[in-house]
């Protein structure tokens, strides 16, 4: 019973599983996109690969009232070790360079797929 109880409790999600779930969510968004994602909202672009999860969240957190990316925002917060709030500006962003949310999501998907292939789960 003790053993079975261990299986029943959720426990921490392995990083590889969390990354795969995030990739799957981004695939859903890109495939189910009919109208312009988040009404064509623009977000800051990112100029580095390190610290990417927090920087991506800092970009996307500024998009409000867009239910399509709310799950992505939540999932990214699980990868970012610090609290992120709207209006934050990371040194990872390309200042004065904004791109459409739809393109940002597509680019994020590309980058995460590469990380997954290379076994970089954190």
């Amino acid at each position: 019973l003790t053993c079975l109880g261990g299986f029943a409790s959720p426990g921490p999600v392995p990083p590889s599983t969390a990354l795969r779930e995030l990739i799957e969510e981004l695939v859903n968004i890109t495939q189910n996109q009919k109208a312009p994602l988040c009404n064509g909202s623009m977000v800051w672009s990112i100029n580095l690969t390190a610290g990417m999860y927090c920087a991506a969240l800092e970009s996307l957190i500024n998009v409000s009232g867009c239910s399509a990316i709310e799950k992505t925002q939540r999932m990214l917060s699980g990868f970012c070790p610090h609290k992120v709030s709207a209006g934050q500006f990371s040194s990872l962003h390309v200042r004065d360079t904004k791109i459409e949310v739809a393109q940002f999501v597509k680019d994020l998907l590309l980058h995460l797929k590469k990380l997954f292939r290379e076994g970089q789960f954190n």
């Epitope: 672009s45 990112i46 100029n47 690969t49 791109i99 393109q103 940002f104 590309l110 797929k113 590469k114």
Partner: nanobody
């Protein structure tokens, strides 16, 4: 939308040098492997060089190895190709492009002409 804008092409004598630049906008440049391809008059498209997203690896066609150097500045969203010891056979239109293996992430510039005149 996505834009790749090449510059730096021109007329040069054999043995001369040129530096091509490619200004990227509308996408997350830092997350893409990038490259330069060229098309000589009456010939097919040929990959010249590629560079990984954060510049940690570079690749060159045998025909340009030791003469051309690819680099990138992610803070400026810019890709470069330094071309030294130019030869007549390097005459071509040079294109900047994303170099991902998934072709749904396929973006190309309009090209810049490099002419090496004997």
């Amino acid at each position: 939308g996505v834009q790749l804008l090449e510059s730096g092409g021109g007329l040069v004598q054999p043995g001369g040098s040129l530096r091509l630049s490619c200004a990227a906008s509308g996408f997350t440049f830092a997350w893409y492997d990038m490259g330069w391809a060229r098309q000589a008059p009456g010939k097919g498209l040929e990959w010249v060089s590629r560079i990984k997203d954060w510049g940690w690896a570079t690749y060159y066609a045998d025909s340009v190895k030791g003469r051309f150097t690819i680099s990138r500045d992610n803070s400026k969203n810019t890709l470069y190709l330094q071309m030294n010891s130019l030869r007549a056979e390097d005459t071509a239109v040079y294109y900047c492009a994303t170099a991902e293996r998934d072709d749904t992430f396929d973006y190309w510039g309009q090209g810049t002409l490099v002419t090496v005149l004997e």
